[in-house]
């Protein structure tokens, strides 16, 4: 059970002579000045008796009258020095001083731990005038004390530019231990030592700490706060908390989970965002990270066609942004794709495979062995070629595009012809005589037009010349062949 702290105050009579001994008398003050609005608390501490040496500041008035001695030094009367009470209780304490009536406009301010208390505090000043002096009682009340109200309170009064300071009144709010540092959740490596810290304060002190693991106490003897628990290592997740004990009772910290770092779970929902002829953009949802941040991911790709003997391709990438463009793929091919990711402990398994296909692309190579010759009898140019290798067609051939450029005496014109996919030869009409014809051929798929072959040139003579040998695609390194017939 939690025991209640005692409420301590040392009562002393407030004033000698005609002034009231406590605020609960029948003596009605002449004037009451509240510093701030607020109700009076149920619990009031009586002002206290003189008798101890006075430590507050004293002002010595210089004013004297013809028939009197100098006025005695001004000082706050002694009051209660230390108040101990429990949290949420009410408290009221006072400062009192007798001021000769010759002083006008005296005000009392309250200070806590060196800072003036302004604003909405429950402070009231009461004036009790007499023939020669006015007794001033400044009361300060707190309706429900918190730990933050702990501290040293003083009154200050200014007279003739002199500051009079009361003895301090120490307020000590006692309660259950209050945590200033609680254990934190952690992700730890299996069988590796780690520390947890717990710190709690009163008052009242001392505060003792017990550690709890999975609902069982770890230490038989309590440790004085602050306490550091060294855990030699865990093999499975555990929940730790600490108990803080003082004379008021016990407070339990939040329970914190200590997780064991593990390899991540495989990514899920690998999906195709976009496909081109030679690339596939994939995304994935990372799996559980195993209580350790992902570092990077690996994408495994293999051609999924039954006849393919293609090797496995592995692409490494950063863990973010869960997106990767797989490049250097073949057009019109099927691929199985999987993703795995790693953290500091190791790699996840590969995600379940997904099937992805590249689209048709434009051919990546030009037709081979292009040959051009003049058939003078029909006034045509015959063109022959070999289709590009199937692997480099990057799709289904739909035909060929033939570019033929005619140049004569500074005049140049280009014409384009389309031919069907079955052919490997074409015939074009001679456009200009006494001219050079330059021919280039490109393969065409639904994915687009591939690169044009190297140019092959043939000279078309004026009418009546003899038909000579054909012109062909040059061997590598031979540029710009011209056959003059």
């Amino acid at each position: 059970a939690i025991t209640e702290a005692r409420e301590e105050a040392k009562p002393y009579p407030l004033f000698p002579g005609p002034f009231p001994g406590s605020l609960q008398t029948d003596h009605t003050p002449l004037l009451s000045l509240p510093h701030a609005s607020g109700y009076q608390p149920a619990l009031m501490f009586s002002p206290t008796q003189p008798g101890r040496p006075h430590t507050g500041n004293v002002a010595i008035p210089q004013v004297t009258s013809v028939e009197s001695k100098p006025l005695p030094p001004l000082a706050f009367k002694h009051t209660v020095g230390h108040i101990i009470l429990s949290e949420h209780k009410g408290v009221k304490f006072n400062c009192s001083i007798s001021v000769p009536n010759i002083y006008q406009d005296t005000t009392i301010s309250w200070w806590k731990d060196g800072k003036e208390l302004l604003g909405a505090h429950h402070a009231i000043t009461q004036f009790y005038p007499d023939d020669e002096v006015t007794a001033i009682i400044a009361s300060f009340s707190i309706t429900s004390v918190q730990r933050s109200d702990n501290g040293s309170y003083i009154c200050k009064m200014k007279i003739n530019n002199e500051e009079i300071v009361s003895d301090p009144i120490y307020i000590e709010v006692q309660g259950l231990p209050h945590f200033t540092k609680q254990p934190e959740s952690m992700n730890v490596t299996r069988n590796t030592a780690f520390n947890l810290t717990c710190q709690a304060v009163g008052p009242p002190e001392p505060v003792n700490i017990f550690w709890v693991q999975n609902s069982s106490r770890v230490n038989e003897q309590p440790e004085k706060s602050p306490s550091v628990l060294t855990v030699p290592g865990l093999t499975e997740m555990a929940v730790f908390s600490c108990e803080a004990h003082n004379d008021k009772g016990l407070t339990v910290s939040k329970g914190v989970q200590i997780n064991i770092k593990a390899i991540p779970s495989p990514p899920t929902e690998v999906s195709i965002r976009n496909s081109t002829a030679h690339s596939i953009l994939i995304s994935w949802v990372p799996g559980f990270d195993g209580y350790s941040p992902f570092r990077n991911c690996s994408i495994q790709v293999k051609e999924a066609d039954p006849l393919s003997n293609g090797s496995v391709m592995i692409f490494n990438t950063s863990a973010l942004p869960h997106l990767y463009q797989i490049k250097q793929l073949q057009a019109l091919a099927n691929y199985s794709i999987g993703v795995s990711c790693m953290n500091e402990i190791g790699w996840s398994a590969v995600s379940p495979w997904i099937l992805a296909s590249t689209t048709e692309g434009a051919p990546s190579v030009a037709p081979l062995n292009v040959t051009v010759f003049l058939n003078e009898s029909s006034d045509n140019v015959d063109i022959r070629w070999m289709k590009p290798p199937t692997k480099q067609q990057d799709g289904e051939l739909v035909g060929y595009r033939i570019s033929h450029v005619w140049q004569s005496a500074g005049i140049s014109k280009e014409l384009l012809e389309e031919v069907g996919q079955n052919g490997s030869r074409a015939r074009i009409s001679v456009q200009v005589h006494n001219a050079t014809c330059t021919v280039r051929i490109a393969a065409v798929t639904r994915g687009g037009v591939g690169p044009f072959s190297d140019p092959v040139k043939i000279f078309i003579p004026a009418h009546g010349w003899v038909d000579y040998a054909p012109s062909s695609t040059p061997a590598p390194g031979n540029a710009d062949p011209v056959l003059i017939i």
Partner: antibody
Framework: EVQLQQSGPELVKPGASVKISCKTS????????MHWVKQSHGKSLEWIGG????????IYNQKFKGKATLTVDKSSSTAYMELRSLTSEDSEVYYC??????????WGQGTTLKVSS | DIVMTQSHKFMSTSVGDRVSITCKAS??????VAWYQQKPGHSPKLLIY???TRRTGVPDRFTGSGSGTDFTLTISNVQSEDLADYFC?????????FGAGTKLELK
């Protein structure tokens, strides 16, 4: 030619452990995940788990977590499965199977395990 | 876990017949389904993957079809060497699972 050669039949006592091996040849060991499958009563197939020899990423069927431990030895291109705390229910045929990226394209010949006192 | 249900434990057929073995997934598995053939005393052998792609060397009388939750392995012109157990297998999500198998036997 791709081959998966498993260790021979095992007769062990209840409570003991056993380690079955699967030696591979004919392909690059680190490029393909190796799975293990249990076949009960000569019929139904149950996936135990898989290991990626390239990076040692492992995944287990929850049902076999704590029962099976998968490892590999890259230097000998061999995969291993250790089964512990054996009971009569573990007396079945166990296969290693290569993940061809779209199903298990090559299987070992199977290892028969008999648990008996 | 995804359950793969092969409703027929046994199917009777004659040589030359056409037979369809079905498999139903308890949830959508896309096209991530493979089919295996297992003969007594042997390891399973991959026939079909990605639902309908025939593995190299597998006779073209074996065809796979379906998507989502319903899948079929069809053997047209059944041969005596086709008499075996057939298993479907989903690899769409972990844990990977298999059907209980369908035994193809002669009438």
């Amino acid at each position: 030619e791709v081959q998966l050669q498993q260790s021979g039949p095992e007769l062990v006592k209840p409570g003991a452990s056993v380690k079955i091996s699967c030696k591979t040849s004919g392909y690059t060991f680190t490029e393909y995940i190796m799975h293990w499958v249990k076949q009960s009563h000569g019929k139904s197939l149950e996936w135990i788990g898989g290991i990626n020899p390239n990076n040692l990423g492992i995944i287990y069927n929850q049902k076999f977590k704590g029962k099976a431990t998968l490892t590999v030895d890259k230097s000998s291109s061999t995969a291993y499965m250790e089964l512990r705390s054996l009971t009569s229910e573990d007396s079945e045929v166990y296969y290693c199977a290569r993940d061809g990226y779209f199903g298990f394209d090559y299987w070992g010949q199977g290892t028969t395990l008999k648990v008996s006192s | 876990d995804i359950v793969m249900t092969q409703s027929h434990k046994f199917m009777s057929t004659s040589v030359g017949d056409r037979v369809s073995i079905t498999c139903k997934a308890s949830q959508d598995v896309g096209t991530s389904v493979a089919w295996y053939q297992q003969k007594p005393g042997h390891s399973p052998k991959l026939l079909i993957y990605w639902t309908s792609t025939r593995r190299t060397g597998v006779p073209d009388r074996f065809t796979g079809s379906g998507s989502g939750t319903d899948f079929t392995l069809t053997i047209s012109n059944v041969q005596s060497e086709d008499l075996a157990d057939y298993f479907c297998h989903q690899y769409n999500s972990y844990p990977l699972t298999f059907g209980a198998g369908t035994k193809l036997e002669l009438k």
